[in-house]
Amino acid sequence: KKVVLGKKGDTVELTCTASQKKSIQFHWKNSNQIKILGNQGSFLTKGPSKLNDRADSRRSLWDQGNFPLIIKNLKIEDSDTYICEVEDQKEEVQLLVFGLTANSDTHLLQGQSLTLTLESPPGSSPSVQCRSPRGKNIQGGKTLSVSQLELQDSGTWTCTVLQNQKKVEFKIDIVVLAFQKASSIVYKKEGEQVEFSFPLAFTVEKLTGSGELWWQAERASSSKSWITFDLKNKEVSVKRVTQDPKLQMGKKLPLHLTLPQALPQYAGSGNLTLALEAKTGKLHQEVNLVVMRATQLQKNLTCEVWGPTSPKLMLSLKLENKEAKVSKREKAVWVLNPEAGMWQCLLSDSGQVLLESNIKVLPTWSTPVQP
């Protein structure tokens, strides 16, 4: 007996071939001997089966000796043995219909779990193997679960159902709702404008929700809500904004915030949360601001940074085109009695400059100039 695997909702074609390449009489029946369809001369006739308007043949193939039974919008209950009677012969085909569905929404928040459920006909014993977009394989029976979804799990999951040494492939598109980056850091000189961007790692037709940016300044004892906003069909509207600092927010995606000036009192880290409509849980992105200031007071040239810096970052003071006068893994460095010239304060990581501030030291009778 030939075995054919079908997918729920799909179309299947069961073949029946005669030795003669001409149109002859044929009949398709199910295991209960109920006629599904057949022919009477040139005409296709239908029986009283439950397939009714979902079954057809292809008239143009009959004179090739092919008498297919085509079933559309397959259901699990269509699983059965189908018999084709042609030329005093009986051809039996066992059709097994499977369905694979994500038993929650296919749009899931980062960190949530994905459960895939296999629908199968009674008496079948299929095995399922799914491959995630990042190449991770998971195996199971009737259900497969993946906990702690990551951004790389977004995309097409390919699941193979095996039964009777035959296989049928399902493709399920999963969208992991997350920001493109879990964390970002912005380095700015004091007084510069700061741009924070929070690009999403997914695109959907309509995006509605609400969000807030909480800020923990390094100098402050507690965190503070800097801005709250609403998102409606990808349009951003500010609900409430703190007076200090006076943040501005873009009206369109990606979420974009502008801080007019980088000041030491703003240096610190923030957490932007976004709650999406009809979703439990929130999307998070951490953002950090590091601010640099270079000053000369009397005979002391000082360079300072505020904000979350890693211990391996190096802060240096050097006269232009010369070796560093001072270089430390600290948040403040200084030079006493600096020579006249253009001094550079550099914040670097393994030789890569992250932030640079220049200050001109004039001969002792002048006051310093910041370019």
Partner: antibody, heavy 123, light 107 residues
């Protein structure tokens, strides 16, 4: 968007070979019979070949043994390998999807066509 | 193979005219007949299937009739966008064959 997009056409000498591709998108490709239909310059339409959902193949007598139709459902792509090309094979080759009516009478039609790719066989 | 013929091979008509195109099969094909419209440089477009069923989205000024060997495509009131070539096709047997086409142009 539901569409078919042909590629692979070009100028080839008599006796040469070409492989045409047709990329399907926006529908379940594996559920449909798919065909190649050609149209010689200034002439009418001529069916060339069809492939069924199970991979069964049908050809116009004049291309049998020279042309091979195939499909890759994982790539949603239909192919036509054309060998021993002749001047009379010069035409725009269209990829077309066959739709079954499900009237219970075996009616079908070409309900979706690609834009076509030109094959010129000339020395 | 089933041969399909069409008449006329071309016709000139004006906007608003009623246009009739006929298609004949070399043997009985019952109602296994489709009609397509093709504009220059474009792919064909399905108008009617099973001899008389209008494809979704096709204007109701198009209609098809006939059975057996003789079929008709009628455009009740010709519109500027209807100037094109029309083909009939049988799907009764393989190979599915097309008629040679009828070109409808502006008078």
């Amino acid at each position: 968007e539901v569409q078919l997009l042909e590629s692979g056409g070009g100028l080839v000498q008599p006796g040469g070979s070409l492989r045409l591709s047709c990329a399907a998108s926006g529908f379940t490709f594996s559920n449909h019979y798919t065909s190649w239909v050609r149209q010689a310059p200034g002439k009418g339409l001529e069916w060339v070949s069809s492939i069924g959902v199970n991979g069964d193949t049908y050809y116009l007598d004049s291309v049998k043994g020279r042309f091979t139709i195939s499909r890759d459902n994982s790539k949603n792509t239909l192919y036509l390998q054309m060998n021993s090309l002749r001047a009379e094979d010069t035409a725009v080759y269209y990829c077309a999807r066959e739709g079954l009516v499900f009237s219970g009478r075996g009616h079908w039609y070409f309900d979706l066509w690609g834009r076509g790719t030109l094959v010129t066989v000339s020395s | 193979d089933i041969q399909m013929t069409q008449s006329p091979s071309s016709l000139s008509a004006s906007v608003g005219d009623r246009v009739t195109i006929t298609c004949r099969a070399s043997r009985n094909i019952h109602d296994y007949l489709n009609w397509y419209q093709q504009k220059p440089g474009k792919a064909p477009k399905l108008l009617i299937y099973a001899a008389s069923t209008l494809q979704t989205g096709v204007p109701s000024r198009f209609s098809g009739s006939g059975s057996g060997t003789d079929f008709t495509l009628t455009i009740s009131s010709l519109q500027p966008e209807d100037f094109a070539t029309y083909y009939c096709q049988q799907t009764y047997s393989t190979p599915p064959t097309f008629g040679p086409g009828t070109k409808v142009d502006i008078k």
